[in-house]
Interface confidence: medium
């Protein structure tokens, strides 16, 4: 039995819902009560959700999934799974048996939008061309790790003296924190940017010294 | 409640046919597969083929391809089987079954019938 | 098509003894994906027909005491009877639905002293 689903990832917005795409050509004559369809996390093959003897079986997956229960006699077994957390990223299995069975694996990719970056100075005051400053800039409650990119006034990338640290929280969400260590010049501006990779969504900020 | 009401013996000459029937009732009987299994005196289950009542597709074992006719009723909701050519080898209980769904276990089984080829 | 070999193919107990009983399968019925094997066992009692006991290798058919146990997975699979009662004596049959056509397993009787 051929089991269809999407090739790439689907991205879901924490806290959003997500469809998890699946379909089967069902036979002529095919009848609900033949099915049994099961959707597993690939790897551990726990129970998401599953539908038997013409019966919704139910969410086995904290009760944030459903199926389209109207749409299952077409071939569409396809999973909506609400209120989508970073532990939910990975790989799903869609596994139908009628008479013959099959399966196909699609993955969830989660993302989460990085809020625009602060910037910080230390020091803050009286500074005068070449001295050394530190420029923090934080961004806050992204998923997946960041990218962070520094550059000048004038776009030219600044990859030295960079330190650049990224800590979960509870929820799997990035805070990310990156230090550029820099001699002033006569006077300048610098930039940050950071990055999601999955959205290519990105925040960025700058400070000038003068 | 699912039964599966089966046809009782039939004592028939060698090279002759015989028609087994199952009666279905419980369920929609065009939802589901209906099995059909032989067991030879002090021998074990031979799965003879499926037929499917909704459309009347097919699904035979090769060893029976020419021995075993399978039909439907709807009206009735009976399954029938067709064995032809009879031999002394054919001397056998037949059993109808039913899968939970799809092409699963058998969860339900007809009582048998009994086919005895004498001459 | 995959031949399911059975052992012992008879066997005599007596009240309140474990037995185990082995069904042995020519390919994998292992299932990769979901990780399940499609192996099921049946109770057939004198005169009657089959009861489905056992399916998907070791989950138990709804109403079917809990003395009863499958185990196994790919090609090697067991049926346990922790403690036999008079009830059970009957021939069990194992049976795979991973592919076409359908087998059963020749079969082991058992007995009662």
């Known amino acids: 039995l051929e089991v269809q689903v999407p090739e790439d990832p689907v991205v879901a917005l924490v806290g959003t819902d997500a469809t998890l795409c699946c379909s089967f050509s069902p036979e002529p004559g095919f009848s609900l009560a033949q099915l049994n369809l099961i959707w597993q996390l690939t790897d551990t093959k726990q129970l998401v959700h599953s539908f038997a003897e013409g019966q919704d079986q139910g969410s086995a997956y904290a009760n944030r999934t459903a199926l389209f229960p109207d749409l299952l006699a077409q071939g569409n077994a396809s999973l909506r799974l609400q209120r989508v957390r970073v532990a939910d990223e990975g790989s799903f299995t869609c596994f139908v048996s009628i008479r013959d069975f099959g399966s196909a694996a699609v993955s969830l990719q989660v993302a989460a939008p990085y809020s625009k970056p602060s910037m910080t100075l230390e020091p803050n005051k009286d500074l005068r061309p070449g001295d050394t400053v530190t420029i923090t800039c934080s961004s806050y409650q992204g998923y997946p790790e960041a990218e962070v990119f520094w550059q000048d006034g004038q776009g030219v990338p600044l990859t030295g003296n960079v330190t650049t640290s990224q800590m979960a929280n509870e929820q799997g969400l990035f805070d990310v924190h990156s230090i550029l260590r820099v001699v002033l010049g006569a006077n300048g501006t610098y930039s940050c940017l950071v990055r999601n990779p999955v959205l290519q969504q990105d925040a960025h900020s700058s400070v000038t010294i003068t | 409640e699912v039964q599966l009401e089966q046809s009782g013996p039939d004592l028939v000459k060698p090279g002759a046919s015989v028609k087994l029937s199952c009666k279905a009732s419980?369920?929609?009987?065009?939802?589901?597969?209906i099995n059909w299994v032989r067991q030879r005196p002090e021998q074990g289950l031979e799965w003879i083929g499926w037929i499917f009542p909704g459309d009347g597709s097919t699904k035979y074992d090769e060893t029976f391809k020419d021995k075993a006719t399978l039909t439907t009723d709807k009206s009735s909701s009976t399954a029938y089987m067709q064995l032809s050519r009879l031999t002394s080898e054919d001397s056998a209980v037949y059993f109808c079954a039913r899968p939970r769904y799809g092409g699963s276990w058998f969860a339900y089984w007809g009582q048998g019938t009994l086919v005895s080829v004498s001459a | 098509d995959i031949v399911l070999t059975q052992s012992p193919s008879s066997l005599t107990v007596s009240v309140g003894e474990k037995v185990t009983m082995s069904c042995k399968s020519s390919?994998?019925?292992?299932?990769?994906?979901?990780?399940?094997?499609?192996l099921a066992w049946y109770q057939q009692k004198p005169g009657q027909s089959p009861k489905l006991l056992i399916y998907w290798a070791s989950t138990r058919e709804s109403g079917v005491p809990d003395r009863f146990t499958g185990s196994g997975s790919g090609t090697d699979f067991t049926l346990t009877i922790s403690s036999v009662k008079a009830e059970d004596l009957a021939v069990y049959f194992c049976q795979q639905n991973y592919q076409y056509p359908w087998t059963f397993g020749g079969g082991t009787k058992l007995e009662i002293k």
């Open positions: 390919q994998s019925l292992l299932y990769n994906t979901i990780q399940r094997s499609y």
């Open positions: 419980g369920y929609t009987f065009t939802d589901f597969d």
